[in-house]
Amino acid sequence: EVEKTACPSGKKAREIDESLIFYKKWELEACVDAALLATQMDRVNAIPFTYEQLDVLKHKLDELYPQGYPESVIQHLGYLFLKMSPEDIRKWNVTSLETLKALLEVNKGHEMSPQVATLIDRFVKGRGQLDKDTLDTLTAFYPGYLCSLSPEELSSVPPSSIWAVRPQDLDTCDPRQLDVLYPKARLAFQNMNGSEYFVKIQSFLGGAPTEDLKALSQQNVSMDLATFMKLRTDAVLPLTVAEVQKLLGPHVEGLKAEERHRPVRDWILRQRQDDLDTLGLGLQGGIPNGYLVLDLSMQEALS
């Protein structure tokens, strides 16, 4: 902590300008009024203060606002934001999307830091839900943001926000997250026609149930293998060979290359070999002819 010393004659800062980069730390502490700093925060980012000088400026703001900075100051923190701890940020009440954008810009190009994660958490909690504009902003800065949320947090995403989601935003989502997002996407895109609907829903299909996959198979969608491989195994298993053939269209030939991988491997084990042979792909491992298939899960449900 900088010790209190009197400001040398003639060095009292009348405004926040570049002359301050030549002030020693103790001179900044003694000669810069915290209230002046707060009102001229927009200038700080344009001035190449040293990292140690930024520590002094932060200290002055902390003394002026022990309960947390007002949004008028937060919006103009610029590089000073990088000096903030998650504990500092938890004291803030950030309501403006412009403030959020300004601070995310400072951290642009870097991994999401604990400070940014705390800031986003404060912002979203303050809003009550992840609205479209917020989601737009967050995924623009952090494409993986959506997949960093828990299924419980994702449940607060309104279906209207799903329009902001791009395919790459879902790259790292696991099945539990897609289970939450898929019904929202289905609702959001429900008024689109067949081919347009499929383009939009495709990225979310890792959360689709069997009945929806069956419905898609009737619409000539030509699902690619990459999408098929991301489907829930339990949703794929009940599909018939004919349904999978219709679902994949010309891409059905790709099953051969994936026959040892889930969900294709498990699906093959559930199909009659006769039916698999109709595909002409040489898929092996189906149920031999003459065998009776007992659906034990159905039996358990009845007993």
Partner: nanobody
Framework: EVQLVESGGGLVQPGGSLRLSCAAS????????MGWFRQAPGKGRELVAA????????YYPDSVEGRFTISRDNAKRMVYLQMNSLRAEDTAVYYC?????????????????WGQGTQVTVSS
């Protein structure tokens, strides 16, 4: 990278004047501050003047305040040091330096690009 070349040094009598020039090239727009340092035989480098590259704000230590003036011409990418009322103790090699890192601009730590230096000798 920033390249710096000093000129204008020489022999001058006590009480006389000299004007040093520093030509900067390369990524000069990334510079935060420019400084003139000097190093007398057997001594460490000391800052004698600094100027903020964008705003043109200046700094001088007490030893040269009122005698030395630093200035810059951004368009020409030049930094100057006007030295008046020179004394024997001003004899040293004078270096031009550019600081692009956000580190102490009042010490040599804050300057990561340096010229080769120009000799200034004050003697009768």
């Amino acid at each position: 990278e920033v390249q710096l070349v000093e000129s204008g040094g020489g022999l001058v009598q006590p009480g006389g004047s000299l004007r040093l020039s520093c030509a900067a090239s390369g990524l000069i727009f990334s510079t935060n501050a420019m400084g003139w340092f000097r190093q007398a035989p057997g001594k460490g480098r000391e800052l004698v003047a600094a100027i903020s590259w964008r705003g043109g704000y200046t700094y001088y230590p007490d030893s040269v305040e009122g005698r030395f003036t630093i200035s810059r011409d951004n368009a020409k990418r030049m930094v100057y040091l006007q030295m008046n009322s020179l004394r024997a103790e001003d004899t040293a090699v004078y270096y031009c330096a550019a600081g692009t890192a956000r580190i102490d601009y009042l010490s040599q730590d804050g300057y990561n690009y340096w010229g080769q230096g120009t000799q200034v000798t004050v003697s009768s």
